[in-house]
């Protein structure tokens, strides 16, 4: 099993290589893949109290990361 | 709606072997990551492992040795081969599948599996 | 592999009650300023029910009473005013690190 991946922790861990725009970070195995291998976000409905839909970043987003850490380029955050 | 149907399970003798399916509708398994739990009666849950869109496999270690996840992409079907049962195997196996940070948000219903002589 | 511990295991509330199950990891599940840590729901006989992804995300159709909070390595899963439809067992998982693993679970039982 290939684990090693999955052992980068927090602050220690690099930022993704930026994906190109047809692709988006997994962020399972970490690294890019094609935007389609992922599972299809499904909408949330009218008035949803969550915030944060499984929705594909464009390449240019980012999630916003702790106090003073850099926020990470993480398109394909499904 | 991603549907996801178990079957196979059943009684087998320890050190037997059986191959369960989890049949896919709503979405592809070429798609996300498509894993397999399961729940020994009383207990809790325990992540068997997945395939991911590649096919690529990942194991919980205490059972990567008796345990193999495969899928057919023309049948939308996942399967979980267990060879060498023991009786702690008895358990419901569910299938379910996962978005890219794990969670997993769509379950089949169970398939119950009896080891035992 | 990175150890689940809920507390309590089990405990007695009523209809209308607010209940908090706590979920400590013995290793942060945080990275690239994500948690990765979920909440399940599990009636009898039935296959577990998302109810809350990345520590607090609330999960498409999941009633508002339900929300969780926590990062790096303490969750809380919250029922604001518990409904009879919501005595069942929690179970919370993190998947930041293979293998994955799962708390033991809490039992919400009716007083």
């Known amino acids: 099993m290939r684990r090693g991946p999955r052992s980068l922790r927090g602050r220690d861990a690099p930022a993704p290589t930026p994906c190109v725009p047809a692709e988006c970070f997994d962020l399972l195995v970490r690294h890019c893949v094609a935007c389609g291998l992922l599972r299809t976000p499904r909408p949330k409905p009218a008035g949803a109290s969550s915030p944060a839909p499984r929705t594909a970043l464009q390449p240019q987003e980012s999630v916003g990361a702790g106090a003073g850490e850099a926020a990470l380029p993480l398109p394909g955050l499904l | 709606e991603v549907q996801l149907v178990e079957s196979g399970g059943g009684l087998v003798q320890p050190g037997g072997s059986l191959r369960l399916s989890c049949a896919a509708s709503?979405?592809?398994?070429?798609?996300?990551?498509w894993n397999w739990v399961r729940q020994a009666p009383g207990k809790g849950l325990e992540w068997v492992g997945y395939?991911?869109?590649?096919?690529?496999?990942y194991y919980n270690p205490s059972l990567k040795s008796r345990f193999t996840i495969s899928r057919d992409t023309s049948k939308n079907t996942l399967y979980l081969q267990m060879n060498s049962l023991r009786a702690e195997d008895t358990a419901v196996y569910y299938c379910?599948?996962?978005?890219?940070?794990?969670?997993?948000?769509?379950w089949g219903q169970g398939t119950l599996v009896t080891v035992s002589s | 592999d990175i150890q689940m511990t809920q507390s309590p295991s089990s405990l007695s509330a009523s209809v209308g009650d607010r209940v908090t199950i706590t979920c400590r990891a013995s290793?942060?599940?945080?990275?690239?300023?994500?948690?990765?840590m979920h909440w399940y729901q599990q009636k009898p006989g039935k296959a577990p029910k998302l109810l809350i992804y990345?520590?607090?995300d609330l999960e498409s159709g999941v009633p508002s009473r339900f929300s969780g909070s926590g990062s790096g390595t303490d969750f809380t899963l919250t029922i604001s005013s518990l409904q009879p439809e919501d005595f069942a067992t929690y179970y919370c998982?993190?998947?930041?690190?293979?293998?994955?693993?799962f708390g033991q679970g809490t039992k919400v039982e009716i007083k």
């Open positions: 395939i991911n869109y590649s096919g690529t496999t």
């Open positions: 990345r520590a607090s």
């Open positions: 998982q993190q998947t930041s690190k293979d293998p994955w693993t």
């Open positions: 709503g979405d592809s398994i070429t798609r996300g990551y």
């Open positions: 290793e942060s599940v945080d990275d690239y300023g994500i948690s990765f």
């Open positions: 379910a599948t996962s978005h890219n940070t794990g969670e997993m948000d769509y």
